[in-house]
Amino acid sequence: AVDLTLLANLRLTDPQRFFLTCVSGEAGAGRGSDAWGPPLLLEKDDRIVRTPPGPPLRLARNGSHQVTLRGFSKPSDLVGVFSCVGGAGARRTRVIYVHNSPGAHLLPDKVTHTVNKGDTAVLSARVHKEKQTDVIWKSNGSYFYTLDWHEAQDGRFLLQLPNVQPPSSGIYSATYLEASPLGSAFFRLIVRGCGAGRWGPGCTKECPGCLHGGVCHDHDGECVCPPGFTGTRCEQACREGRFGQSCQEQCPGISGCRGLTFCLPDPYGCSCGSGWRGSQCQEACAPGHFGADCRLQCQCQNGGTCDRFSGCVCPSGWHGVHCEKSDRIPQILNMASELEFNLETMPRINCAAAGNPFPVRGSIELRKPDGTVLLSTKAIVEPEKTTAEFEVPRLVLADSGFWECRVSTSGGQDSRRFKVNVKVPPVPLAAPRLLTKQSRQLVVSPLVSFSGDGPISTVRLHYRPQDSTMDWSTIVVDPSENVTLMNLRPKTGYSVRVQLSRPGEGGEGAWGPPTLMTTDCPEPLLQPWLEGWHVEGTDRLRVSWSLPLVPGPLVGDGFLLRLWDGTRGQERRENVSSPQARTALLTGLTPGTHYQLDVQLYHCTLLGPASPPAHVLLPPSGPPAPRHLHAQALSDSEIQLTWKHPEALPGPISKYVVEVQVAGGAGDPLWIDVDRPEETSTIIRGLNASTRYLFRMRASIQGLGDWSNTVEESTLGNGLQAEGPVQESRAAEEGLDQ
């Protein structure tokens, strides 16, 4: 069980001095700084017992394994359920304390009731201040039962719960109808998942026989020992004023554990410390009684005396719980109550014994949980004891459980059970996670979920280039920190794996699954230069650039052109995917917009330095296209064009532009201005005879508008080769705009 104790200080005359402390004896408990050690939590649980809101309680952390709750201002702040949560992962455990008001109408005869599955539980609420109304019993805050107030027996209201099952566990309360919840008697019922003396999934395993009021845990078969006792079977008493699984904690204050309630993980519940009893744990045990709540009787034999903290203190020559065993009987000495080994290791286990006659090697044996008996391979004989050493065969998971060292001589026999925990070395279930990458380094998070057992003592990261047969490189890292793999090759895939270890020999787990992490390309360093640009329409821009000449191959995959429209706060990005390109046509731009333009070289996902920016103003958009364009040959060198003005003009037309192109020709088209915008016809002269031409035209206001439909027409006859087409409107010659 998790070594977690919730202490309640019951100085009830002054709520402001009341405090709750949660103490963990777990390794690394409460650090909370990483995934390996969640913090201790201590809080009031208002889900079932709701009390009037008061000022917030103060939580103080004292070191890594202790947390204290203070700040109670009035007695009602104390009433209810408090819980402490500690331990990591599957061992996360909640310890619960239920506090009753000493001034309540009804008081519990006993707050914590631990019973076995199938037992009958009886909760008894003693009348402290009588009311002549019904008594309502609740379970976990919900209605459970009603009693008439006349049903009190000897001043007590009883709730009988026959054949209880684990779901019956919880907080029970007895309240007079109409009384404040603070006047209720609160109880905690813990129902073990098995019948008496059994544990395990099917309740098939036998409990070790917990002593001194220890309770057998129904999941793991361990004894949860009362405060003040230790050992696999709670056979050993701590020194007065000490508690914790190894007696490592000390009660605060000069009066030791007086006035403290101790709550331990289920199925133990809560009790006074060893040597104390009463509702406020302030009464010493009566003569002949000892232990938590003074529940145990000494019954010492052979002149033993009763100590209220530890039980029988035996005179010289005797030992045993009741001083019933003579020292002539052999005795196992200083056997650890619990040992931990890693799977598939072959540990050595020592067992020491004394007695008269003196034990020899053959008289000491070791028994495994499956009944196999191991004989010692060697023994060390000293004046006061014999220590037998056992070489254990390769451990398997089934070896977990209670082992027994047994000594037999003609003077009698003794045995000591101890728990062996076979732990599975941790194996990562997932690959490590790539956080960031550069061309020569990878930053990796080694924290991954794992199968097997913690705690994690070391994390190893193994890595090598993908498809390589070279040895793996290894780095040992702190479990809680990210790792930087350095001095790597650019643009290279690396196979990376995690290996976890737990404490002890053979604690290294198998390597986790590999993951491929690729270093980035080298950053492109060349800065392009914008050579020029020209507007090819209201929404089209042709840009050209250059790169400085440097020796060696070009480091780059292409170019990124960026256009920033400051007015609208919009950025346009154009990818040019050839590193050889030095020009690009940008289309679909917004007419009449002022753009800031730059260009960058890119390589993989990395961008090089941007060119100095250029500022470009696109002309506004022009008018709609002229309508019904028609071409009519007049001679072997002249074609007349006629059209209708565009509709819905935004303003007066400044000119028309005619585009002339030889049908099927490969040359650039010619553009001819018509400067009299009121005209609806023009004659194009200087054309070649018997030649097919294509014509289209557009209007201009502030900017050029949309093109009209394209028309075809051929010149007549066989004339001379003309110098080139010109335009005449109403016999007036106009210049040529190419």
């Epitope: 002549q132 109304t133 019904d134 309502i136 209605y143 459970f144 039962y145 009603t146 009693l147 008439d148 107030w149 006349h150 049903e151 109808l177 109409e178």
Partner: antibody, heavy 117, light 112 residues
Framework: EVQLLESGGGLVQPGGSLRLSCAAS????????MDWVRQAPGKGLEWVSS????????YYADSVKGRFTISRDNSKNTLYLQMNSLRAEDTAVYYC??????????WGQGTLVTVSS | QSELTQPASVSGSPGQSITISCTGT?????????VSWYQQHPGKAPKLMIY???NRPSGVSNRFSGSKSGNTASLTISGLQAEDEADYYC????????????FGGGTKLTVL
């Protein structure tokens, strides 16, 4: 779903007897206090009798005390009302109701008792 | 056995709010926060509408609300609807050990 179903009503002569039953389902009958409430034609509700979960404690309205007996069989999830020495003024629809913390939270549909010669 | 005092009838138009009072003594309404209100349509069983003075069971419209002052409890129905037309009864826990509970005489609510 909580359900209460009364039965046993009918026509009876003055001085006669009748036993009403109330079959309960959808909840743990043995944990709840139960009541009988009646309503004479065109009149209001009148509490008749109560019984506690254990069956050991019972209470009656003055108008029926000594003539009516409330009982329960927790193993059969059934509530009873034994009515003796019936009078014309006992004519009413009799309802059984579940009581939870001084509130009759579920009611049956009622059974009509007519006392007439 | 004294019953709690309720008005014999109240009425209101759709959309309006109405309040029904229930007056007792310090031994019942005034002494305990266990006042309940029940709705009964003709020929039907009573239905719990409010318990413990002001709590609504699940499924009961939030147009129904309860309160208490001294020895008098009140049921308020806001946004009156045609289906609210029914008899309404109050009841209270009582300190008399011979009584399981005490009812009001009932109030007929008419929706005009």
């Amino acid at each position: 779903e909580v359900q209460l179903l009364e039965s046993g009503g009918g026509l009876v002569q003055p001085g006669g007897s009748l036993r009403l039953s109330c079959a309960a389902s959808g909840f743990t009958f043995s944990k709840y206090k139960m009541d009988w409430v009646r309503q004479a034609p065109g009149k209001g509700l009148e509490w008749v009798s109560s019984i506690y979960p254990s069956g050991g404690f019972t209470y009656y309205a003055d108008s029926v005390k000594g003539r009516f007996t409330i009982s329960r069989d927790n193993s059969k999830n059934t509530l009873y009302l034994q009515m003796n020495s019936l009078r014309a003024e006992d004519t009413a629809v009799y309802y059984c109701a579940r009581e939870k913390m001084a509130t009759m939270d579920y009611w049956g549909q009622g059974t009509l008792v007519t006392v007439s010669s | 056995q004294s019953e709690l005092t309720q008005p014999a009838s109240v009425s209101g138009s759709p959309g309006q709010s109405i309040t029904i009072s229930c007056t007792g003594t310090s031994s019942d309404v005034g002494g305990y926060n266990y006042v309940s209100w029940y709705q009964q349509h003709p020929g039907k069983a009573p239905k719990l509408m409010i318990y413990e003075v002001s709590n609504r069971p699940s499924g009961v419209s939030n147009r129904f609300s309860g309160s208490k002052s001294g020895n008098t409890a009140s049921l308020t129905i806001s946004g009156l609807q045609a289906e609210d037309e029914a008899d309404y009864y109050c009841s209270s826990y009582t300190s008399s050990s011979t009584l399981g509970g005490v009812f009001g005489g009932g109030t007929k609510l008419t929706v005009l």
